[in-house]
């Protein structure tokens, strides 16, 4: 059980206040984290509160400003990047968001040696992506879907690709579906470790069907936004990987890296690229039916001036019970011999663990094991491997950092974080300097987040980087809800849940219950993290009990739970939320006439299906930007879990799992349907089809659209959204305004 430290004593009660909706919308109780921008083994950059860029040397204890806020302000810079030779800084301004990760910006190069901006051969604008080489000060950038190279910032650019075309050919940047569902980055180019080679992806979207929606703006006529967006079963992008020698780019030009034969024989994806050395690269490929992944290690053949990918260096990862990997196929972390690597994949018991691959995957040596999961490999040095897992005390929603000594035999394991600030910190991530000389730990909760700096050899804490003192002080007179994390055992399934309870919670009383659900494959909602958000307010001020439940399909508890939803989305996720609600009712403090469910995106899909389950459990519910049919969602994501919407594959379940098919069942619930009209991700089409089905079934419901808003419903829409949902829930629960 995680109980927030209670500071409530009867004598103090009058000075304590509940959270308000305004607190949440204003971000009054938001926290800060500190991630050092490492530039060497012992140095990092950080943007100070007054916007100076400061270089810190851990060993000397000295710090100095390398770039003043005045210089930053002169071009309205919101971001920066120091060249590895420390001679130049790029300054980023005119940030213009595109999709989840992508944006365009204007870039200025500042010469630190003379304190002036580089004039002559300035960069074009707007640029889609720009980065320094890992050594020196070469620049690679993407402009109008083509890649350019500069040997020095003041040099004229060398154009690497010429076929880039808006919405057709993307070089060095992903198209929509690769950005959102495969790479999770705004870039698709990778420098080799010493900057000799530049690898890049080319995405050909010529044959992809286009999603078109209106953007209303302020003009007399709305604009139409067109995005090549492959929905389930549609034509996919065609990807090719090229590598160019950046020292002599014109000599042989870009060389294509071959796709493994077993992948090339049918539709496939490229999933990631990892440089091993300057002359060895590792590519990961995935069949369109995403249960087979191939990791291919390719070598530069000097005599051929091409990349050779021998069959002996092809490593196959196949899932027989679900899809390959977790959300994504894991990426390898290479050891110092530049051929063997560490990788997370399922062991024979169906838990994701670290394996060491020296020759073949079949002969992999398992490094971690147990009925828990290794989650991320942070760093491999010559004598240590740092990773995170949820092993400690058997709480799947925790993250601790471990060190395994790989230099000694047998390897010994040490938990670096488990006992540091045990009550406050149970969910960590880490950021390592070169050679793991030092590292920062960022603790996200359950207490107030704190970031600390540590010695990579001894694990000794050196200093606190950010402890959120102001937040701690601000919360001193706030009646925060209590939180507990527990589990239910139902029919051999473990359902972990987080319950958020009103500050003066009394088990003998009855409370309205709100279920907050996401429930998507490989997600996790029950996490030991700090948050003061809308549901905190609902518990604190409005006296609701809020519960989050991780059911079948969720992550980090083994493949049995994870792959239970394979090819059957919309069934067990909903069942498990319903099962949990029944168990909560049995606990005795839930008013069973006042139960609601809400979710966003995948959660909107699950909440809609739960409301339409015909159980009579839910009085009302909200779906924000829900998927309504898997035929409407992106191929890469959907097919990973559902297969193809074809007669000979899984069309039947595609049809059976729609929200529209259950329109009749909404008759006895209050349903609030919300969607942004400019949602590039879960298209407004999804809610339009729900609404149409409800109207056709003559079922009353409430709806709200947000004009020109995307999947995030940001800005003023956020305030409107949460205010609107609050009114809806209070009305549903008969709570006075």
């Amino acid at each position: 059980i995680v109980l927030r430290p209670s500071r409530v004593h009867n004598s103090e009660e009058n000075t304590m206040r509940a959270l308000t909706l305004k607190d949440i919308l204003n971000g009054t109780f938001s926290y800060k984290t500190f991630f050092p921008n490492w530039i060497s083994g012992q140095e990092y950059l950080h943007q100070s509160a007054d916007n100076n860029i400061v270089l810190y040397n851990i060993e000397t204890g000295q710090s100095y400003t390398i770039l003043s806020n005045r210089t930053m302000k002169s071009v309205n810079a919101s971001n920066y990047g120091l060249s590895p030779d420390r001679q130049f800084v790029y300054l980023e301004s005119d940030y213009s968001k595109l999709w989840r990760y992508s944006y365009t910006a204007t870039y200025y190069i500042y010469d630190l040696s003379n304190g002036e901006f580089v004039r002559g051969n300035e960069l074009p604008r707007p640029i889609q992506y720009l980065c320094w080489s890992p050594v020196g000060s070469k620049l690679a950038y993407v402009y109008q879907n083509n890649i350019y190279l500069k040997q020095r910032p003041g040099d004229p650019p060398f154009q690497i690709t010429f076929n880039g075309r808006e919405n057709k050919i993307f070089n060095g940047i992903p198209d929509w579906v690769y950005e959102e569902e495969m790479l999770a980055t705004k870039y698709a180019l990778w420098w080799s470790p010493n900057g000799k080679f530049l690898a890049y992806a080319e995405f050909n979207d010529t044959d992809i069907p286009v999603i078109a929606y209106s953007y209303y703006g302020d003009e007399q006529y709305p604009r139409t936004i067109n995005i090549p967006y492959p929905k389930a079963g549609a034509k996919n992008p065609v990807v090719r990987i090229f590598i160019i020698d950046t020292t002599y780019p014109a000599y042989v030009g870009p060389q294509e890296v071959p796709v493994p034969a077993m992948i090339a024989s049918s539709d496939y994806y490229f999933s990631w690229l990892t440089w091993v050395t300057d002359e060895r690269v590792c590519l990961q490929w995935l069949k369109r039916v995403q249960n087979v992944s191939v990791l291919s290690i390719c070598d530069f053949r000097e005599d051929w001036q091409t990349w050779d990918c021998p069959k002996t260096q092809e490593h196959i990862e196949e899932s027989r019970t679900g899809w390959a990997g977790g959300f994504f196929v894991s990426t390898p972390v290479f050891s110092y011999d530049a051929i063997s690597y560490y990788k997370i994949f399922s062991d024979k018991d169906g838990y994701k663990h670290i394996h060491y691959i020296k020759d073949t995957v079949e002969n992999a040596i398992q490094i971690t094991s147990g009925k828990w999961e290794a989650i991320n490999i942070f760093r491999v040095t010559q004598d240590s491997l740092f990773y995170s897992s949820n092993e400690f005390e058997e709480y799947p929603g925790r993250r601790n950092i471990y060190r395994i000594s790989i230099g000694s035999y047998p390897p010994s394991k040490k938990c670096v974080t488990c006992h540091l600030r045990k009550e406050r910190c149970q969910y960590y991530t880490a950021s390592f300097s070169d050679y793991a000389k030092y590292y920062a730990l960022v603790c996200y909760g359950p207490g107030i987040p704190i970031s600390t700096l540590h010695d990579g050899r001894t694990d000794q804490e050196i200093k606190i980087l950010e402890e959120n003192k102001e937040l701690e002080n601000a919360l001193k007179n706030i009646q925060l809800p209590k939180e507990e994390i527990k589990k239910l055992e139902v029919d051999e399934i473990t359902l972990w849940y987080k319950m958020i309870l009103p500050p003066q919670f009394d088990r003998s009383k009855k409370y309205p219950l709100l279920i907050q659900v996401y429930g998507g494959p490989c997600s996790q909602s029950v996490r030991s993290v700090f948050a003061v958000n809308w549901i905190s307010y609902l518990a604190s001020k409005e006296g609701m009990v809020i519960a989050l439940v991780d059911g079948r399909g969720t992550a980090f508890q083994g493949d049995k739970l994870l792959y239970a939803v394979y090819r059957k989305l919309g069934v067990y996720e909903v069942e498990d939320q319903i099962t949990a609600v029944r168990k909560f009712i049995e606990m005795g403090f839930i008013d069973e006439k006042r139960i609601a469910i809400w979710g966003w995106s995948y959660g909107g899909y699950v909440s809609s299906l739960a409301l339409a389950s015909g159980t009579g459990l839910f009085k009302c519910g909200i779906a924000v930007a829900p998927v309504s049919s898997w035929e409407y969602y992106a191929s890469v994501y959907t097919e990973r879990f559902m297969g193809l919407p074809t007669k000979d594959d899984n069309l039947e379940h595609y049809k059976n799992s729609t929200v529209m098919a259950r329109a009749e069942y909404f008759r006895n619930v209050d349903y609030l349907l919300i969607h942004g009209t400019a949602d590039d991700n879960v298209h407004f089409q999804n809610s339009a089809q729900i609404a149409k089905a409800l109207v056709n079934a003559q079922v009353d419901f409430q709806a709200m659209w947000y004009s020109d808003q995307n999947h995030g419903l940001s800005g003023l829409s956020t305030n409107h959204l949460y205010t609107h949902m609050t009114h809806f829930l209070k009305q549903c629960f008969s709570l006075s305004d």
């Epitope: 071959p258 796709v259 493994p260 034969a261 090339a264 069959k311």
Partner: antibody, heavy 119, light 109 residues
Framework: DVQLVESGGGVVRPGESLTLSCAAS????????MGWVRQAPGEGLEWVSG????????YYADSVKGRFTISRDSSKNTLYLQMNSLRAEDTAVYYC????????????WGLGTLVTVSS | EIVLTQSPGTLSLSPGERATLSCRAS??????LAWYQQKPGQAPRLLIY???NRAIDIPDRFSGSGSGTEFTLTISRLEPEDFAVYYC???????????FGGGTKVEIK
Amino acid sequence: DVQLVESGGGVVRPGESLTLSCAASGFTFSNYDMGWVRQAPGEGLEWVSGIRGRGGSTYYADSVKGRFTISRDSSKNTLYLQMNSLRAEDTAVYYCAKENNRHSFFEYWGLGTLVTVSS
Amino acid sequence: EIVLTQSPGTLSLSPGERATLSCRASQSVGHYLAWYQQKPGQAPRLLIYDASNRAIDIPDRFSGSGSGTEFTLTISRLEPEDFAVYYCQQYYNNWPPLTFGGGTKVEIK
């Protein structure tokens, strides 16, 4: 020494089936990709089918796709080619061949077995 | 599929002479080309792989060259045992179908 010995050839009528076997020795059979290559009387070489050592992926020439099935039994160090719906144009000497471990050229070949399809 | 065209179809030479055999690919196969020798009633035997690398136990009078679409097998001085049929094979990216050329017969003049 690497040895590949084919067997199972013979005379069959069009539409009938035949299974060829290839007994392998002198190398770790399960680690290597294997293939079948045929040669019609007085003609050149034609690749028929291949199978991966790891992963077991199978590949076929268009001329035999849907009719022939390649398989392997690593416990017996044996490669097979199941040939159904045989046609006159399938008449050939069938060679079993071991691919190089890095690339798909054939380092070692068996002596071949003759398949004759005739009415 | 990639088509390999070998020329000439037949090459009539005397022992001691130099033989030059050509193999042309319908599209680039990089360096992924092998040469085989086949004598009557025997199985093919690997001579050259990766366009220019000699296989084990192959005498150095055999050499291969070329890349992309044009390849050559050269036998510097023909020995009596070299009279046979020679085939080229591409294995570009190890992708099936693997294809062979039609063969060049080197016969005694």
